[in-house]
């Protein structure tokens, strides 16, 4: 289906005469009749097989024909056809004079014809106009023509029907050749198939409109490429729908049994080590100083008296700490800072090495005690002196200082004041009415010259580094008890400290 269009442009009839040569009165009021028919080698009268059309009076004698297509007029003239355009045609254009208003053929006199032209040829469908001019003795007609397809018809012969649509039956426009051109987002022979969201899984996804991705049962995700696990699957995944494959650390049909409670819940406190011991169970191994199922309770680690050699224990956040007495070190004050090479035993004590020389023990002579034999044994605790005598420690033994009138080792004997030479150390005895008086030689004092008054050996503070000084009464010498980290007779040498420990 298409339209043969004829555009009349100019008609010249300068003399205003009819085909017979007779002039028109008052002028030739000209209209046209057009006949379109199948191709004839010699155009002859007969049915206008492709159609006819007439115009109103377009002008008088000579005139140009206005293009009226935009105004809804009749130029170009339209000759529609409802068949495949054959590509060839015959065209007859007659110019007629209209003496009155009735333009019907039967109303016109036979000699009202002004001119008649006939052409034939081939004509392809197209938008371009073919310009032609036909001249006779008295008239000239200029015109152009073309064949175009009707709406929705396409192709070289206007034989291909194509009506654009955007509905359930298709989503397309028509190309010039009549082929379908799918609207964006549609595909298929009739553009009925939507193009799904890019990446939408071919098997697991589909769409009912473009850029959509609807998932088939068992699949999910923007692109329908994630399977849906079995309903109730807790800590699992799937590779095909409705499966449930447990993640690491989970068990049970629905992966809801915690096989790795330690990792998932961190139940152990205070740096304890957690061990999984089956479904939803665990064991905490506590660090020192903690107890309880989750090692949540803090122990006082000093309760077990861990510090040795007189060390004092202090509780700390991360355990305990032993404060060691002088001469000891180590976590539990178990190591001595001295060895026998340092001559640590005083008052004639003998040194014995222990633990391959790491520490030592002193074997003390009678009357001395202490880890370094630095303490004199007090032999006066039993009050052996009679008659109010005063007991005095003297080196390895003891002696009694008797009241006037008494003598003997334990003041057990009554004597005259000077009879028994009560003045010691060569002291001179003087009898007095109420007792006696001794005059003592140099270096001695006391009522009986019994007290040695040589200079106190510790008076000069001979011990360094805050060491404790003891006087060795048997030799009038001093003994230094060194604090932790020092050795030597005066504690003047720092020892190489033991390596530091992390506690």
């Amino acid at each position: 289906s298409g339209v043969f269009q004829l555009q009349l442009q100019e008609f010249i009839n300068e003399r205003g005469v009819l085909a017979s040569g007779r002039p028109c009165e008052p002028g030739c009021r000209t209209f046209f009749r057009v006949c379109l028919k199948h191709f004839q080698a010699v155009v002859s009268p007969g049915p206008c097989t492709f159609g006819t059309v007439s115009t109103p009076v377009l002008g008088t004698n000579s005139f140009a024909v206005r293009d009226d297509s935009s105004g809804g007029g009749r130029n170009p003239l339209q000759l529609p056809f409802n068949f495949t355009w054959p590509g060839t045609f015959s065209l007859i254009i007659e110019a007629w004079h209209a003496p009155g208003d009735d333009l019907r053929p039967e109303a016109l006199p036979p000699d009202a014809l002004i001119s008649k032209i006939a052409i034939q040829g081939s004509l392809a469908v197209g938008q371009n106009w073919l310009l032609d001019e036909q001249t006779s003795t008295l008239t000239r007609l200029r015109y152009s023509y073309r064949v175009i397809c009707s709406d929705n018809y396409y192709g070289d012969n206007c034989s291909r029907l194509c009506k654009k649509r955007n509905d359930h039956f298709g989503h397309y426009v028509c190309q010039p050749d009549g082929n379908l051109s799918c609207l964006p987002g549609w595909t298929g022979e009739y553009c009925q198939q939507p193009i799904c969201l890019s990446g939408c899984h071919e098997q697991n996804g589909y769409c009912s409109k473009p850029a959509e991705c609807l998932c088939r049962p068992g699949w999910q995700g923007r692109l329908c490429n994630e399977c849906i696990p079995h309903n109730g699957c807790r800590h699992g995944t799937c590779s095909t729908p409705w499966q449930c494959t447990c993640d690491e650390g989970w068990g049970g049909l629905f992966c809801d049994q915690d096989l790795n409670y330690c990792t998932h819940h961190s139940p152990c406190k205070n740096g304890a080590t957690c061990s999984n011991s089956g479904q939803r169970s665990y064991t905490c191994t506590c660090r020192p100083g903690y107890t309880g199922v989750d090692c949540e309770l803090e122990l006082s680690e000093c309760d077990s008296n861990p510090c040795r050699n007189g060390g004092s224990c202090k509780d700390q956040e991360d355990g305990y700490h032993c404060l060691c007495p002088p001469g000891y070190y180590g976590l539990h004050c178990e190591h001595s800072t001295l060895s026998c090479a340092d001559s640590p035993c005083f008052n004639g004590g003998s040194c014995r090495e222990r633990n391959q020389g790491a520490n030592y023990a002193c074997e003390c002579p009678p009357n001395f005690t202490g880890s370094n034999c630095e303490k004199k044994v007090d032999r006066c605790t039993s009050n052996p002196c009679a008659n109010g005598g005063q007991c005095l420690n003297r080196g390895p033994s003891r002696m009694c200082r008797c009241r006037p009138g008494f003598t003997g080792t334990y003041c057990e004997l009554h004597v005259s004041d000077c009879a028994r030479n009560p003045c010691a150390h060569g002291g001179t005895c003087h009898d007095l009415e109420n007792g006696l008086m001794c005059t003592c030689p140099a270096g001695f004092s006391g009522r009986r010259c019994e007290v040695r008054t040589s200079i106190d050996a510790c008076a000069s503070s001979p011990c360094f580094n805050r060491a404790t000084c003891y006087t060795d009464l048997s030799t009038d010498t001093f003994v230094c008890n060194c604090p932790y980290g020092f050795v030597g007779s005066r504690c003047e040498f720092p020892v190489g400290l033991p390596p530091s420990f992390p506690w």
Epitope: H230, G236, Q243, C244, T245, C246, L253, Q257
Partner: nanobody, 120 residues
Framework: EVQLVESGGGLVQPGGSLRLSCTAS????????IGWFRQAPGKEPEGISC????????YDADSVKGRFTISRDNAKNTVYLQMNSLKPEDTAVYYC?????????????WGQGTQVTVSS
């Protein structure tokens, strides 16, 4: 093709007993763990019990502990669920399932189910 067929379901009074059977085919029975789960109308499925390929019972749901016992007979390719002291809340469709591996860790195949109704 893996197939699991359950049987033994039915109507039982509260306090009564039932024994469900699950007969398997299409795979080497000894190699797979087998378990039971159930689903009551409008509720999520609940894992009941599972027995590993070696026969160790991997777990029992708290709701059935002491009442339900799972066992397997490899010679008959069958797993059993002995259900005692049944309660109305045990009413559900009971499914036999396997993770397709030796340990009770998931579900890959399951049967059509057997209905258990506990009602007086």
């Amino acid at each position: 093709e893996v197939q699991l067929v359950e049987s033994g379901g039915g109507l039982v009074q509260p306090g009564g007993s039932l024994r469900l059977s699950c007969t398997a085919s299409g795979f080497t029975f000894d190699d797979y763990a087998i378990g039971w789960f159930r689903q009551a109308p409008g509720k999520e499925p609940e894992g009941i019990s599972c027995i590993s390929s070696s026969g160790s019972i991997t777990y029992d749901a708290d709701s059935v502990k002491g009442r339900f016992t799972i066992s397997r007979d490899n010679a008959k390719n069958t797993v059993y669920l002995q259900m005692n002291s049944l309660k109305p809340e045990d009413t559900a469709v009971y499914y036999c399932a396997t993770p397709g591996i030796a340990a009770c860790r998931g579900i890959h195949y399951w049967g059509q189910g057997t209905q258990v109704t506990v009602s007086s």
